[in-house]
Interface confidence: low
């Protein structure tokens, strides 16, 4: 079943794409966004844990010697994104016994750049999307997903890794951003807030949504995540905003109903396979795209972000379950697990549709439209 569409057009009411948003207001901690450090990839998701690299849980790269020369996708750690800090930071700490990789968390010391220098890079994620400034790019065709409708068996691993809830995806889920831009899905995870406090990572014209889903993919040009980290287009993340709607979302309920089983940090359970595409908006043709980074350490850049214009609707009860069930490090609730928005530093956000046309309350204001960089594709 497809998730109900919430907003046909710009999920955020069509703002600007935040192209030149050096340090937008969203980059400063808002009242709803408690200051948090940026979250590097979780230790639980370190290679060898069978966690496919996620957008926020991108794998921290283990020395090849530890992996006998190669890391398997299933063994790469996933990366989680940090919360909205007053000043985005990165914190790392040991999380698992036996793990020799640093673990990170939202908030606290040390700053993320100390955990991973890439977290101080110029082209980081998430960002504030301003539809009005987005460059309409007709070459951006509808996304294509293949193999996302999974049978009940084999079951999938659902894990509370301390910074998100992550679903490890089996081989065979293929996604194409366009001709020759093909990827394999590795894992998906969510970002959320707390009671009365939204927790999406990306924002639209400064508006933060209740939650956000990230489906992390590895380019078919690479066999392992560590090979793809930092390479332009090596990783791609599909992101969608989750909003409150009147009805229960049956697709999400298949996951949310199991959260109590993994309330404790580091716990996991097995869930029947489901239609992964039903967790995403139904309109694959309208989206924003830009090049950024993992939103948690190692904060590797070169990640292609595709943010759906259409949102997904969950009931109020479901959103509450998401934000109020899991526990993270140090006997603290796992909440507000999002990183602050990062400056665009000259990046242009592209749109597959004319997002700046009659889509924003500011439409009457003169706007400098950006041009599509891939118009000839």
């Amino acid at each position: 079943q497809r998730l109900p569409r919430m907003q046909e057009d710009s999920p955020l009411g069509g703002g600007s794409s935040g192209e030149d948003d050096p340090l937008g207001e969203e980059d400063l901690p808002s009242e709803e966004d408690s200051p948090r450090e940026e979250d590097p990839p979780g230790e639980e998701d370190l290679p060898g844990e069978e966690d496919l690299p996620g957008e926020e849980d991108l794998p921290e790269v283990k020395p090849k010697s530890e992996e006998e020369g190669s890391l398997k996708l299933e063994d790469l750690p996933t990366v989680e994104a940090p919360g909205d800090p007053q000043e985005p930071q990165n914190n790392a700490h040991r999380d698992k016994e036996g793990d020799d990789q640093s673990h990170w968390r939202y908030g606290g010391d040390p700053p993320w750049p100390r955990v991973s220098p890439a977290c101080a890079g110029r082209f980081q994620s998430p960002v504030d999307i301003r539809p009005q400034l987005a460059a309409f790019c007709p070459a951006l065709r509808p996304l294509e997903l293949l193999g996302f409708q999974l049978p009940p068996l084999p079951e999938l691993r659902l894990r509370n890794n301390g910074h998100s809830v992550q679903l490890t995806l089996p081989p065979g889920l293929e996604m194409a951003l366009g001709p020759g831009r093909e990827y394999r899905a590795l894992q998906l995870h969510l970002h959320w807030g707390a009671a009365g406090r939204p927790g999406s990572e990306h924002t639209v014209e400064g508006h933060r949504f209740p939650a956000e889903i990230h489906v992390v993919h590895l380019s078919t040009a690479f066999a392992r995540v560590d090979e793809a980290l930092g390479r332009p287009g090596g990783l791609a993340v599909l992101a969608a905003f989750l909003e409150e709607g009147p009805e229960e979302n049956s697709a999400y309920e298949q996951l949310l109903s199991r959260l109590e089983e993994i309330a404790e940090e580091g716990s996991e359970t097995q869930v029947p396979g489901l239609d992964i595409s039903a967790l995403l908006p139904s309109d694959f043709s309208r989206y924003f795209q830009y090049e950024g980074s993992l939103t948690t350490p190692p904060c590797a850049q070169g990640v292609i972000w595709t943010v759906f214009n259409q949102t997904v609707m969950l009931s109020a009860k479901q959103l509450h379950t998401l934000s109020d069930t899991l526990w993270g490090p140090g006997d603290s609730r796992l909440q507000l697990n999002f990183r602050a928005t990062q400056p665009l530093n000259g990046r242009v956000i592209e749109a597959s549709f004319p997002a700046g046309v009659d889509s924003s309350p500011r439409a009457a204001e003169p706007v400098q439209l950006n041009s599509c960089l891939a118009a000839g594709d």
């Epitope: 294509e144 293949l146 001709p179």
Partner: nanobody, 120 residues
Framework: QVQLQESGGGLMQPGGSLTLSCAVP????????IGWFRQAPGKEREFVAA????????QYSDSAKGRFTISRDNSKNTGYLQMNSLKPEDTATYYC?????????????WGQGTQVTVSS
Amino acid sequence: QVQLQESGGGLMQPGGSLTLSCAVPRFTLDYYAIGWFRQAPGKEREFVAAISWSGGTTQYSDSAKGRFTISRDNSKNTGYLQMNSLKPEDTATYYCAAGRQLEWRTYDYWGQGTQVTVSS
């Protein structure tokens, strides 16, 4: 209502070959996957093969692997299913479909089918 049009069906002897064609409206073929399905009398419709809109990904049912080949020519807005080493059990009405994903559940457009009969 968008309608896909299959052609190429007919009566064939076992071991023979046949190529089915599927004409797809331009706006659909540009970015939709194409799938082939078949339905034998008294049986449910079953998946045969599918190809992504870029042509870079193909999927086959177990019965089609090694004998059938799916392809597409976007310049002609047409998809193809080449069937070799035909068997009597391949007798069915063959349908083509177009959709965002290769799985039939999300196929938006269907043809009316073309009959393939394999008999000696």
